[in-house]
Structure formats: structure tokens, C-alpha cells
């Protein structure tokens, strides 16, 4: 016996109470695929969430976060508080980045300043809580006798060896 439910399109469900007739999803529910035996409950976007896309009979609602919060998790399942640049979110709230670290976004954690000396370079612009350091030429390049008029060597294209 062929399963009549497989004929039910998205936006409907196969109603076993009515001899497997395809019934439309009731209000506040949806089915995004055909052949469903029930419709799923629509997500609500309330409180700290706001509606980005309304629920329809064939697709769930999509939520965003209100101003001052940003989405986390799959399909914006959570809203996390924004912090200011130069801060990170801890269990106790937004805290300034420790010395030697920075965060240039409203989310995420404070990251250590780049260590210019690891690349044989010097610090051109000091780091702040909001900005990473800017590395400049190596100290040797800046020593007396080194010509500042020499144009920099052209950057190599990745994967190409020098001619």
C-alpha cells in the first residue's frame, strides 16, 4: 500500500485522523519538507530577540538580536551582550583588556599584541586596548648608514620563486 503521506507538500502535514489527507499547517506552525506527519512549532523572537524573518507555513521564523547584543550559536539561538572596543565579556560583565592585549570589536576576547621582534621587526605604533601594535622595518633597517631612500623590494607573489 503506497504511503499517501509522501504526496503531502511542504506547508502541510499528513493528517492520520483524516485518512492521511494533507492538511495545511495550523497557525504558528510550519513544515519545511514534504511528507511530514506533524508541523513544527514556529520560533518566537521576543525580548532580547527581534524578528528578522516571519514564520510561514513552509519555513521557520528567523531571529536577530536587538541593538547592544549579537547573535551566538546556530540560527542565532542566543544573544550575547556587546562590549566596547578595548573590552571583553566575562562572567562579571564587560571588562577592559589587560595591558598587552587588545580587542578591536564589540564581541570576542582580548588578544595579545603582535610581537614584532618575532618577525625581526620593530614597533612602529604602540598598541592600545583597542588596537594592535603596528610593526615597522627591522631595527637593522633603521640603523645609521642604511639608506632610507631605497625603495622597498616588491612583494613576492605567493607560490612564485624569485627570478
Amino acid at each position: 500500500l503506497q504511503d499517501l503521506c509522501s504526496n503531502c507538500p511542504a506547508g502541510t502535514f499528513c493528517d492520520n485522523n483524516r485518512s492521511q489527507i494533507c492538511s495545511p499547517c495550523p497557525p504558528n506552525s510550519f513544515s519545511s519538507a514534504g511528507g511530514q506527519r506533524t508541523c513544527d512549532i514556529c520560533r518566537q523572537c521576543k525580548g532580547v530577540f527581534k524578528t528578522r524573518k516571519e514564520c510561514s507555513s513552509t519555513s521557520n521564523a528567523e531571529c536577530d538580536c536587538i541593538s547592544g547584543y549579537h547573535c551566538l550559536g546556530a540560527e542565532c539561538s542566543m544573544c550575547e551582550q556587546d562590549c566596547k572596543q578595548g573590552q571583553e565579556l566575562t562572567k562579571k560583565g564587560c571588562k577592559d583588556c589587560c595591558f598587552g592585549t587588545f580587542n578591536d570589536q564589540k564581541r570576542g576576547i582580548c588578544r595579545p599584541w603582535t610581537n614584532c621582534s618575532l618577525d625581526g621587526k620593530s614597533v612602529l605604533v604602540n598598541g592600545t586596548k583597542e588596537r594592535d601594535v603596528v610593526c615597522g622595518p627591522s631595527p637593522a633597517d633603521l640603523s645609521p648608514g642604511a639608506s632610507s631612500a631605497t625603495p622597498p623590494a616588491p612583494a613576492r607573489e605567493p607560490g612564485h620563486s624569485p627570478q
Partner: antibody, heavy 118, light 111 residues
């Protein structure tokens, strides 16, 4: 499964501040709303306010000037402070978890009776 | 004065079907799903129906919910003596950005 337990004083004097704490056990405080609801003797349920785990709050306008709700995710607790108490604040106070998908209050504490009297 | 309006009392005999109504406005029931709670004396409310007509696990299928426009109703079929309790409707209110409750209905099972 998730359980909620209210704690705080049972008797408070008029004009003082009520402080209640709700401890969440058996689950995480993250990704839910946490509400306070009260029920005066012989009356219905009144929503006081909620806090989302990341700190967003909203309060019943009739109580907004007197209420503060805070959350401590490290302790898995959230708290209610209600100031300038009068006898009309005498009630059973419940904490509850509000689901952040369909917004039903699916887990409740057993409630704590607060009497405002001198 | 509750935002949602329920009859203060309802009654029925064992085996009967009873319905409890809940009336609101466009900012709450008209635009949002309705939840129902059952409360026995001296205990905390329990979620009975969510999203208009969904039953949490463990709730008997004798309990059903429906919504039309700015009103909702809870139906209890095959009424039993243990159904005697207070019933509250609740919905999110967009103007408050929070939930609102009905005043509650005391259900009495006669006989």
C-alpha cells in the same frame, strides 16, 4: 532535570527592601529567560520581570521603579530586589524559567512566602 | 485587574467536557501564542499547554488548547476529580515586551 530553588527572608518590614535569590541546578542558566512571578494570598499570578542570561532585563511597568533583577552565571543564580515594600507586596514569590523558543514558563521553583509586616 | 480575562470559576461532573476561555487583545493573544498553567492549592503552577495547543510530555491528551483571533480556550474532556485546580492563561504582550496572565479560573469537579 532542571530545578529551581528560591531563598530569602520570609518576613520583611514595610519600607525595607526584599532580596530573593533563585538557584538553578541540574542545567545551565545560559540561553533562557529567568522570571520572577508573585501571587498575593487568594489572588492570581503577577509577572514581576525577567532577565536573559546575558543580562537583558525587562520589568512589569507597575513595579519598574522599585525592582531590580540580576544574574550571576558563574553561580547559576539570579536575584530579585524589590524596595519600598508595603503590605500589598505580601505574596508567594516564584522564580521560573522561560523558554527562549516558545516562551512558556516550563520550570518553576516551589515558591517562597514573603510577608510584609512591622 | 488582569490583562487577560478569564471566568473566575467553571465546573463540571466527572466524564464531562469543560472549556475555559481567555480573552485578550491584538498586542498579546492576537499576535502571540498562548500558554496554560495548572495550579493546585499550595503548589507552584505547572505548564499544561504551550504554543496554543502543544502538551508537554506527561500531560494527558484530555487537555487541549486552541486559539482564534484574540481569544483562546482550554478544553478538558473526560473530566476527573484530580482536575480540580486553578487554571491560568498567559501570553506574551508586545507592548510590554513581557508576559501577561489571566486572572485564573477555579475549576470545581462536582459530585
Amino acid at each position: 532535570q532542571v530545578q529551581l530553588q528560591e531563598s530569602g527572608p520570609g518576613l520583611v518590614k514595610p519600607s525595607e527592601t526584599l532580596s530573593l535569590t533563585c538557584t538553578v541546578s541540574g542545567g545551565s542558566i545560559s540561553s533562557y529567560y529567568w522570571s520572577w512571578i508573585r501571587q498575593p494570598p487568594g489572588k492570581g499570578l503577577e509577572w514581576i520581570g525577567y532577565i536573559y542570561y546575558s543580562g537583558y532585563t525587562n520589568y512589569n511597568p507597575s513595579l519598574k521603579s522599585r525592582v531590580n533583577i540580576s544574574v550571576d552565571t558563574s553561580q547559576n543564580q539570579f536575584s530579585l530586589k524589590l524596595n519600598s515594600l508595603t503590605a500589598a507586596d505580601t505574596a508567594v514569590y516564584y522564580c521560573a524559567r522561560t523558554h527562549s523558543y516558545y516562551y512558556g514558563m516550563d520550570v518553576w521553583g516551589q515558591g517562597t512566602t514573603v510577608t510584609v509586616s512591622s | 485587574q488582569s490583562v487577560l480575562t478569564q471566568p473566575p470559576s467553571a465546573s463540571g461532573t466527572p466524564g464531562q467536557r469543560v472549556t475555559i476561555s481567555c480573552s485578550g487583545s491584538s498586542s498579546n493573544i492576537g499576535n502571540n501564542p498562548v500558554n496554560w498553567y495548572q495550579q493546585f492549592p499550595g503548589t507552584a503552577p505547572k505548564l499544561l499547554i504551550y504554543s496554543n495547543n502543544q502538551r508537554p510530555s506527561g500531560v494527558p491528551d484530555r487537555f487541549s488548547g486552541s486559539k482564534s483571533g484574540t481569544s483562546a480556550s482550554l478544553a478538558i474532556s473526560g473530566l476527573q476529580s484530580e482536575d480540580e485546580a486553578d487554571y491560568y492563561c498567559e501570553a506574551w504582550d508586545d507592548s510590554l515586551n513581557g508576559p501577561v496572565f489571566g486572572g485564573g479560573t477555579k475549576l470545581t469537579v462536582l459530585g
